[in-house]
């Protein structure tokens, strides 16, 4: 069976974690309201029932207060993400209390028993939410619970258990192990706050699922399709993190959560939007870049609430790195005739020339196969802002890069040797961009000339309707 | 201002047990970790683990594991580090060094440490 | 664990004049933009001290004659001008993950 690898490392390490001899060891949770953007600061300890520190340490009762809920850990201390999340929440909010919950002792376990003590510390936030409702201006609408892995789930619990709604809890890669398929009462789920939004980065369809694939949300983002984010390979990591190990690919995709979060939070003039789309394959191919009717949304900190009938899936693609956004096309080829094809889906990439900048090179993914007389649907982004979309370059590869497609062309070959060259037809492309929402069709430059084959290029430029807008809102226009 | 006190040198014959205090005073005991860290003579520094002095809960690094236990008397905001079965070896300083349990947990205030010799 | 190699592992300097002391790292101790890369001055028989923190802080009460820089896994400490007190040894620590580990020291003495 697949090794059950965590956040920090392999569950089984802990069978052979120390107790804490002669020691005696306080089953608690601590709340320690970060003062300070300076991390080294001891910050202050709320406890209920005790109003001092409030006072003393500026408890604002009518901001906007924040929750930080770290997850399973085995080394006992807090992990690097949970500063810079803290000092993204004070750079964006200023006059925010934020406040980290502290279950170190109770998360510094077997994960199965850190699991088990999710309940209890999900007691304690809403106890703590409890007493400071009793206080004059404060408002459970004001509460944001932001969860990370297993700390999503506690979130919930702690969402379930108060007195009242609170306002929004944000899951960041809510844990898989043990809450996969749990019931809504055991995990976190929709009816835990007025607004509850998760993002996926790590869930895997094969093996152990380190995040929770179900939807648990309002609206549950899938980046990248939920499971490999670019950056995180073993290749990428060997280079540029602590260590080139398989727990740290692991960490790089789990942690991707809160970094988009805090992306969210310092970037707020580079916004990622996320789709709607039933799947991943169905968003791979391009067909779930609308805006329309609540379709698309901010994602992290600036996601506009949206409480659906259902869970939301949505989904997008972005950097390796910060600030994450891309921008997302779809492309439409209608495909009016090809020959001799052949057993082999041929390789196509596109080029764009915008007014701001021109894209790279970028492969068109054939999710399927290319149907004939068909229109074929494709996704392709990119990196920059390329501005008013002026033509386009398609290229259909030459020589064949894989061993497989070289196999499958002699295969031809031995069964049709005087096989006539392969081509095919298009006379248009429609793009429609997810970020502006505008559509476009581009038409081939010489209407006489619409064929391409293996080698060759085909060019297509702006035909002379212009830009076509639907009555479909720009993801843009709807920032909060 | 804030400080950490170790107890005095201590000269032990081999097979003998020790215990070493470190007292805090200036600043909230509990809302700092406290690390353990031994100098051999001639030699740089090792970490031995910490203990989290809030929760109890110690943590010992790989060379550590079996003759050493941390403890706390928070009451008295002292952490404790008793060595069993002493070798030869194990003379050396011992340092406590106190980390936050936030930021980049670098050890901040050290106590001026504590000489224990081991010889028969 | 993290390896710290320092170099060189003594140094002799006139007063006056600068002394560098650099610590590489087995693999990179930063985290995003943070460097969790540490300093520490130990003179004979006394604990060691925190000089810098987070690769190019300076502690509280340490002279600006100290000076840190470097990120990923090549840090340096920079001690200019050199000092007559300044006779120490010198270690690096990275505390990006448990176990915090130090490097093997540098000896400084003044000629």
């Known amino acids: 069976s697949p090794v059950p690898f965590g956040p920090e490392g392999r569950l089984e390490d802990k069978l052979h974690k120390p107790k804490a001899t002669q020691t005696e060891v306080k089953p608690s949770v601590r709340f320690n309201l970060r003062t300070s953007k300076d991390p080294e600061h001891e910050g202050c300890y709320l406890s209920v029932g005790h109003s001092q520190p409030l006072e003393d340490c500026s408890f604002n009762m009518t901001a906007k207060t924040f929750f930080i809920i770290h997850g399973w850990t085995m080394s006992g201390i807090f992990e690097n993400w949970l500063h810079k999340l803290v000092s993204a929440l004070h750079t964006r909010e200023k006059d925010a209390n934020v406040v980290v919950v502290d279950w170190l002792p109770l998360a510094h376990q077997l994960y199965t028993d850190a699991v088990n003590n999710t309940r209890v510390v999900g007691h304690s936030i809403a106890r703590m939410l409890d007493w400071l409702q009793e206080k004059d201006d404060f408002s459970l609408g004001n509460v944001h619970l932001i969860g990370y892995s297993l700390g999503a789930h506690v979130a919930g619990y702690a969402g379930n258990f108060v007195k009242g709604t609170v306002g929004r809890i944000t899951g960041l890669d809510p844990a898989g192990p043990m809450f996969e398929g749990a019931d809504i009462h055991k995990r976190l789920s929709p009816d835990d706050a007025d607004f509850v939004d998760v993002l996926h980065t790590y869930t895997r369809s094969f093996g152990l699922s380190i995040g929770i694939q179900m939807p648990v949300g309002h609206i549950d983002i899938y980046p990248n399709g939920g499971d490999f984010q670019p950056g995180c390979g073993l290749n990428d990591v060997l280079g540029s993190i602590a260590y080139g190990t398989i727990t740290e690919v692991v960490k790089c995709e789990h942690e991707r959560a809160v970094h988009l979060f805090v992306d969210s939070l310092v970037n707020q003039d580079k916004p990622s939007f996320a789709f709607q789309c039933t799947d991943s394959n169905r968003f791979k191919k391009g067909i779930c870049l609308s805006c329309r009717k609540n379709r698309c949304n901010s994602i992290g900190y600036n996601a506009k609430k949206m409480r659906n009938k259902r869970n939301s899936k949505m989904y997008l693609k972005t950097r390796a790195g910060m600030p994450f956004r891309v921008y997302h096309y779809q492309m439409k080829i209608h495909v009016f005739s090809y020959k001799n094809m052949g057993e082999i889906e041929p390789t196509f990439y596109v080029t764009l020339y915008g007014t701001n900048a021109d894209s790279q090179t970028l492969p068109l993914e054939i999710v399927e196969r290319i149907e004939q007389n068909a229109t074929n649907t494709f996704l392709v982004y990119t990196e920059e802002d390329l501005g008013d979309l002026l033509k386009i370059q398609l290229t259909w590869e030459g020589a064949s890069q894989s061993w497989y497609n070289l196999w499958k062309e002699f295969r031809s070959y031995l069964s049709q040797p005087r096989n006539p060259g392969r081509e095919l037809n298009i006379r248009r492309i429609r793009v429609k961009s997810g970020e502006t929402q505008r559509k476009l069709t581009f038409c081939t430059e010489d209407p006489e000339n619409t064929s391409i084959s293996p080698g060759r290029e085909l060019w297509f430029r702006k035909c002379r309707d212009g830009w076509r807008m639907k009555n479909e809102t720009s993801p843009t226009v709807e920032l909060p | 201002q804030v400080q950490l006190v170790q107890s005095g040198s201590e000269l032990k014959k081999p097979g003998a047990s020790v215990k070493v205090s470190c007292k805090a005073s200036?600043?909230?005991?509990?809302?700092?970790?406290l690390n353990w860290v031994r100098q051999a003579p001639g030699q740089g520094l090792e970490w031995m683990g910490w203990i989290n002095t809030y929760s109890g809960v110690p943590t010992y690094a790989g060379d550590f594991k079996g003759r050493f236990v941390f403890s706390l008397d928070t009451s008295v905001s002292t952490a404790y580090l008793q060595i069993s079965s002493l070798k030869a070896e194990d003379t050396a300083v011992y340092y406590c060094?106190?980390?936050?349990?936030?930021?980049?947990?670098?050890?901040?205030?050290w106590g001026k440490g504590t000489t224990v010799t081991v010889s028969s | 664990d993290i390896v710290l190699t320092q170099s060189p592992a003594s140094l002799a300097v006139s007063p006056g004049q600068r002394a560098t002391i650099t610590c590489k790292a087995s693999?990179?101790?930063?985290?995003?933009?943070?460097?969790?890369m540490h300093w520490y001055q130990q003179k004979p028989g006394q604990p060691p001290k925190l000089l810098i923190y987070?690769?190019?802080n300076l502690a509280s009460g340490v002279p600006a004659r100290f000076s840190g820089s470097g990120s990923g896994t090549d840090f340096t400490l920079t001690i200019n001008p050199v000092e007559a007190n300044d006779t120490a040894n010198y270690y690096c620590q990275q505390t990006i993950e448990d176990p915090p580990t130090f490097g093997g020291g540098t000896k400084v003495e003044i000629k």
């Open positions: 200036g600043y909230t005991f509990t809302n700092y970790g």
């Open positions: 060094a106190r980390r936050g349990y936030y930021g980049r947990r670098f050890f901040d205030v």
């Open positions: 693999q990179s101790v930063d985290y995003d933009v943070d460097s969790y």
């Open positions: 987070a690769a190019s």
